[in-house]
Interface confidence: medium
Amino acid sequence: HGTELPSPPSVWFEAEFFHHILHWTPIPNQSESTCYEVALLRYGIESWNSISNCSQTLSYDLTAVTLDLYHSNGYRARVRAVDGSRHSNWTVTNTRFSVDEVTLTVGSVNLEIHNGFILGKIQLPRPKMAPANDTYESIFSHFREYEIAIRKVPGNFTFTHKKVKHENFSLLTSGEVGEFCVQVKPSVASRSNKGMWSKEECISLTRQYFTVTN
């Protein structure tokens, strides 16, 4: 057997909606032939299922084998280093991978202008891997919220934040003209999930968008 291989120092999930990626840190002084074995345990079925015998990357997409995450008690994963006939001890994720660990995202943000207001529509994520009945709004069916950050260009400061409880929102620009850039971060008030800011969407507001009312 020779010298024993060290175990991967840490193993963790990084997940978005139906995009569940397992990551691990490499063993020190790994060789060109070192690879990693991945196994998965579903809570309620107390046996480890081998997923990959020899991954040479430091991550593995487990979405396809965790599609029931949102209807299950969650998973644990474990990884060990393999080099020829030698292998290390397993390193297990130190927390249960459940729906609570999924980082919330939005699909996109669409902006349009109407009478001096910026009207926004948040498109929810529609991942290809998701089963047809497992939509974002069916899984997170209540208390969806969004933080809206608005930035006026030029200028690198965010001049306002507001929280909205719907996928449609409106922003009053107080008669200002110029380019306005908007970002959105989702949350669910009843849950502890983290949210990721969307990419910035910008729209130009000129005088022509204002109508005069008495």
């Epitope: 933080e147 930035r151 400061f157 965010t158 934040h161 929280k163």
Partner: nanobody, 126 residues
Framework: QVQLQESGGGSVQAGGSLRLSCGAS????????MGWFRQAPGKEREGVAV???????SYADSVKGRFTISKDNGKNTLYLQMNSLKPEDTAMYYC????????????????????WGKGTQVTVSS
């Protein structure tokens, strides 16, 4: 999960100084907005000072010129140096962080910090 732990609070006379620290564990992000927020009894939580990963800082008007925020990246520690303290600075002080991609520019108006410490009490008596 990133964990934040504040320290350095206490009681001080008006005009005195305190230095708050916030240790961040399991912290590997190169892009962040970190800051100090406070909440006095019966009041809303408010932003005090924030720092972006590029080093830019932002302060609430009420503390400008008196408080300084800084971060030691090597130690993964956030600081708030508070000078010329006033009784109205009395509050529970929280360290908070928003991490990851696409963040808007850091600001004391930030509502959606993802990670919060448990807080450290600062009491300023006249």
């Amino acid at each position: 999960q990133v964990q934040l732990q504040e320290s350095g609070g206490g009681s001080v006379q008006a005009g005195g100084s305190l230095r708050l620290s916030c240790g961040a564990s399991r912290y590997t992000y190169s892009s962040y907005c970190m800051g100090w927020f406070r909440q006095a009894p019966g009041k809303e939580r408010e932003g005090v000072a924030v720092i972006d990963s590029d080093g830019s800082t932002s302060y609430a008007d009420s503390v400008k010129g008196r408080f300084t925020i800084s971060k030691d990246n090597g130690k993964n520690t956030l600081y708030l140096q508070m000078n010329s303290l006033k009784p109205e600075d009395t509050a529970m002080y929280y360290c908070a962080a928003d991490l990851g991609h696409y963040r808007p520019p850091c600001g004391v108006l930030y509502l959606g910090m993802d990670y919060w410490g448990k807080g450290t009490q600062v009491t300023v008596s006249s």
